[in-house]
Amino acid sequence: DSEEDEEHTIITDTELPPLKLMHSFCAFKADDGPCKAIMKRFFFNIFTRQCEEFIYGGCEGNQNRFESLEECKKMCTRDNANRIIKTTLQQEKPDFCFLEEDPGICRGYITRYFYNNQTKQCERFKYGGCLGNMNNFETLEECKNICEDGPNGFQVDNYGTQLNAVNNSLTPQSTKVPSLFEFHGPSWCLTPADRGLCRANENRFYYNSVIGKCRPFKYSGCGGNENNFTSKQECLRACKKGFIQRISKGGLIKTKRKRKKQRVKIAYEEIFVKNM
């Protein structure tokens, strides 16, 4: 039985506003469906924790779709939730910070950043534009925030003032909406599966960030996006370790893990699905 890791979690009444999902479908990605109508609808976005507008094609899709903002709020948020799951702050970097830089297999070479565990600093590297691993950041600041040690030995958070690498000036970072889970892998792991524009039916895998798993889909053979892998293993390697838990002050949390597949699902659903 291939094992995965279990989160050691603490149930608390604490500072972070909880992710108040009353129904599992509130965690689904917005799905416009295959049809071509242009209909204004609303869905609940688990990353911003808000109901947002999207364009629905008129058929299929999923249950995370509402006629009005009010209906969306009514179905997917609650004000009286009083518990969240969080993990204790570790003075450890995410595992992927220790990976060697990996250019991937493509040839659209661009400058990216990785954390060099030997020099203990973020450095630029030549990235091919696809695959590779999670130790891959678009900006120096992002790399430093996640992988470099702050002055007190903790990871630098995204809420404070950061050193601007280009001119060494201190610049306030834009405050992100705090969320219980943030994704720090390649941004394409958060994009929906995209068949593309051609007519082939190739078996591919994409990372479903809502359920945290790699799932098969049919690729048309051209276009699409980078959330597209020829094997499940490739998909997992690129995207699986991207979720980092956060506490309210923005400090990164590395979750301690134990091996057991079923338990992960339960811990995950407790956060995203359970009636609270």
């Epitope: 070479y109 661009i110 400058t111 950043y113 060099n116 030997q118 020099t119 600093q121 973020c122 450095e123 630029r124 590297f125 030549k126 900006t139 120096l140 690498a165 280009v166 001119n167």
Partner: antibody, heavy 119, light 108 residues
């Protein structure tokens, strides 16, 4: 004081190879990238490639990948660039320049080596 | 590769005048990755501006840089005799790193 001192001028025949050196001093050689850039007479600058001496990481401009070889000798803090199968269009001043690991601000440059390819 | 096209190729101006040098990229380049170098005859290039607008050490304040996407500009508000040189724009967002062909700023 940071210094990059390059080897002397070279006159080569078409088809030959040339190996240029760039001796670094005044900084930790292995902690920076070393770039090679060339400039043909009256022309612009052309990036050939870069090497990070600590682990020998090298990135080439595809245009030069089959003919250029970048190496570094950590013991002498010297970077080398060898260019093979020389042709007349390779006549140029070849510069080495260093940059940090976080950007490509080439803040110190060698004085340049003139390579002339002529039969 | 990203092609950087500088214009004009030659700019003839007098001391005290304002100079505007342009650099156009064939694809979008993040402003953090767009640099400028100055080169005088018989010398190696010198880093002049980094990250589109940050003046390198020792560069006078009459120099400024701006732009985003595919259009970048180096401006000299009032030319001094020592400013006459060749200026190259440079991008390191995409490999291979590339330079513009240069703008020669000459005395009229």
């Amino acid at each position: 004081e940071v210094q990059l001192v390059q080897s002397g001028a070279e006159l080569k025949k078409p088809g030959a190879s040339v190996k240029l050196s760039c001796k670094a001093s005044g900084y930790t050689f292995t902690s920076y990238w070393m770039h090679w850039v060339r400039q043909a007479p009256g022309q612009g600058l052309e990036w050939i490639g870069e090497i990070k001496p600590d682990k020998g990481r090298i990135n080439y401009n595809e245009k030069f990948k089959t003919r250029a070889t970048l190496t570094a000798d950590k013991s002498t803090s010297t970077a080398y660039m060898e260019l093979s199968s020389l042709r007349s269009e390779d006549t140029a001043v070849y510069y080495c320049a260093r940059s940090s690991v976080i950007d490509v601000a080439m803040d110190y440059w060698g004085q340049g080596t003139t390579v002339t390819v002529s039969s | 590769e990203i092609v950087l096209t500088q214009s004009p190729a030659t700019l003839s101006l007098s001391p005290g005048e304002r100079a505007t040098l342009s650099c156009s990229a064939s694809s979008s380049v993040s402003s953090s990755y767009l640099y400028w170098y100055q080169q005088k005859p018989g010398q190696a290039p010198r880093l002049w501006i980094s990250g589109t607008s940050i003046l390198a050490s020792g560069v006078p304040a009459r120099f400024s840089g701006s732009g985003s996407g595919t259009k970048y500009t180096l401006t000299i508000s009032s030319l001094e005799p020592e400013d006459f040189a060749v200026y190259f724009c440079h991008q390191w967002s995409h490999y291979p790193f590339t330079f513009g062909q240069g703008t020669k700023l000459e005395i009229k």
